[in-house]
């Protein structure tokens, strides 16, 4: 039961995480105008990965897309790439994990296949989460660098009578959404990998166990015991002669080509 719960929770957490990564990627508020130096501005600027926007106090908002591709900073292109890779990997991971869920029966799919798919989706979620975290972190680093550069510029060349207020940008909501979403996807991926260990058929382990059997006349049949994997509720061997009232985690499949020692 614990394996199913872990897998299901991992799937849900990853789903929320990937939805968050998509939302963050689409959001316009990756960087927002820093109002520390000019808190009384009647015009508010904010920028996303795909367009920059200006919100006037009167309520009008105007957004302009970055229609150039070559003219954009390499770092911005890199962030875009990381976020898109994260979304694509996450989407594929979700698709794979749907079929890997223990609670969903698809024909006569073996547990070994489901374990394999769970591991695959878990790794995909981990990489997806890392891509999102990396993308957001690169953008945040770019903002911090530009912030201090513009701060330095603010106090130079101001000998004239006319004051020019340079617009500085700080962290936008999308960065926090991206960090949280990336973290959730990463956690979901780890949970899927943990669930995979519990799903894996361990019959091949019995050969190893049988070598250690001393003089006892114990017959080891396939499916006779569920060997320990060292995770959760599987640390104790469970007999199958329980009147047929088995939990889903206890349903044993026959040995296959996959060995999880």
């Amino acid at each position: 039961m614990a394996v199913t719960a872990c897998q299901g929770l991992g799937f849900v957490v990853s789903l929320i995480g990937i939805a968050g990564i998509i939302a963050a990627t689409c959001m316009d508020q990756w960087s927002t105008q820093d109002l520390y130096n000019n808190p009384v501005t009647a015009v508010f600027n904010y920028q996303g990965l795909w367009r920059s926007c200006v919100r006037e106090s009167s309520g009008f908002t105007e957004c302009r897309g970055y229609f150039t591709l070559l003219g954009l900073p390499a770092m911005l292109q890199a962030v875009r790439a990381l976020m898109i890779v994260g979304i694509v990997l996450g989407a594929i991971g979700l698709l794979v994990s749907i079929f890997a869920l223990k609670c969903i029966r698809i024909g006569s799919m073996e547990d070994s296949a489901k374990a394999n798919m769970t591991l695959t989706s878990g790794i995909m979620f981990i990489v997806s989460g890392l891509c999102a975290i990396a993308g957001v972190s690169v953008f945040a680093n770019m903002l911090v660098t530009n912030f201090w550069m513009s701060t330095a510029n603010m106090y130079t060349g101001m000998g004239g009578m006319v004051q020019t207020v340079q617009t500085r940008y700080t962290f936008g909501a999308a960065l926090f959404v991206g960090w949280v979403a990336g973290g959730l996807t990463l956690i979901g991926g780890v949970m899927m990998c943990i669930a995979c260990r519990g799903l894996a058929p361990e019959e091949t382990n019995y050969k190893a166990v049988s070598y250690h059997a001393s003089g006892h006349s114990v017959a080891y049949k396939p499916g006779g015991f569920k060997a320990s994997t060292g995770f959760g509720s599987n640390t104790k061997n469970k007999k199958i002669y329980d009147g047929g009232a088995r939990t889903e985690d206890e349903v044993q499949s026959y040995p296959s080509k996959h060995d999880y020692v």
Partner: antibody
């Protein structure tokens, strides 16, 4: 059609509070801001303050301690209160709707308020 | 606060001639986000409320004759009436719409010579 109309007492005694109402039609009070502007006789325009669609306000730094702008969405009305008035507050008071570029695109006809004992 | 300085205080121009009014701000009104200058021009005729002519320094409000044009960027702005008409006699104001308080210039009185 956008319309704004100021109303209120034409005469206010010194040290009292000036209260004006701006009744509007033709636009949403929750979407657009309304500014109050005054013009002393024979002089230029002076921006008093504004209340935006979301209810937030901004006031002129010289009047901030005396002025309050509010709105009643159900009545489609904006109000201006200016406390502790003096003869220097005698002016034509206008309300105006904010549009593109924060520019004031529609104005009321204005109401003359005289501060005198 | 941003100080708006208009020049000249008054101007007399012959009918059909070009009229030029200047406005200078103490801070830049150029917004880097959209590269627009938040400066507005108004026309006020005697006994009437002001009328919006130009916003974003150069964008004419709908219904405003095309003889009115705005130019300039940053801190220096100009309102030009290409061919003065009798109905253009008024006081013209510039306004900072970039930073609170949204200050007005002192006004320029335009008369016919």
């Amino acid at each position: 059609q956008v319309q704004l109309q100021e109303s209120g007492p034409g005469l206010v005694k010194p040290s009292e509070t000036l209260s004006l109402t701006c009744t509007v039609s033709g636009f949403s009070l929750t979407s657009y801001g309304v500014s109050w502007i005054r013009q002393p006789p024979g002089k230029g325009l002076e921006w008093i303050g504004v209340i935006w669609g979301d209810g937030s306000t901004n006031y002129h730094s010289t009047l901030i301690s005396r002025v309050t702008i509010s709105k009643d969405t159900s009545k489609s009305q904006f109000s201006l209160k200016l406390s502790s008035v003096t003869a220097a507050d005698t002016a034509v008071y206008y309300c105006a709707k904010a549009g593109r570029g924060n520019a004031l695109d529609y104005w009321g006809q204005g109401t003359l308020v005289t501060v005198s004992s | 606060d941003i100080v708006m300085t208009q020049s000249p205080d008054s101007l007399a121009v012959s009918l059909g001639e070009r009229a030029t009014i200047n406005c200078k701000s103490s801070q830049s009104l150029l917004n880097s986000g959209n590269q627009k200058n938040y400066l507005t021009w108004y026309q006020q005729k005697p006994g009437q409320p002001p009328k919006l002519l130009i916003y974003w320094a150069s964008t004419r409000e709908s219904g405003v004759p095309d003889r009115f044009s705005g130019s300039g960027s940053g801190t220096d702005f100009t309102l030009t009436i290409s061919s003065l008409q009798a109905e253009d006699v008024a006081v013209y104001y510039c306004q900072n719409d970039y930073s609170f308080p949204l200050t007005f210039g002192g006004g320029t009185k335009l008369e016919i010579k």
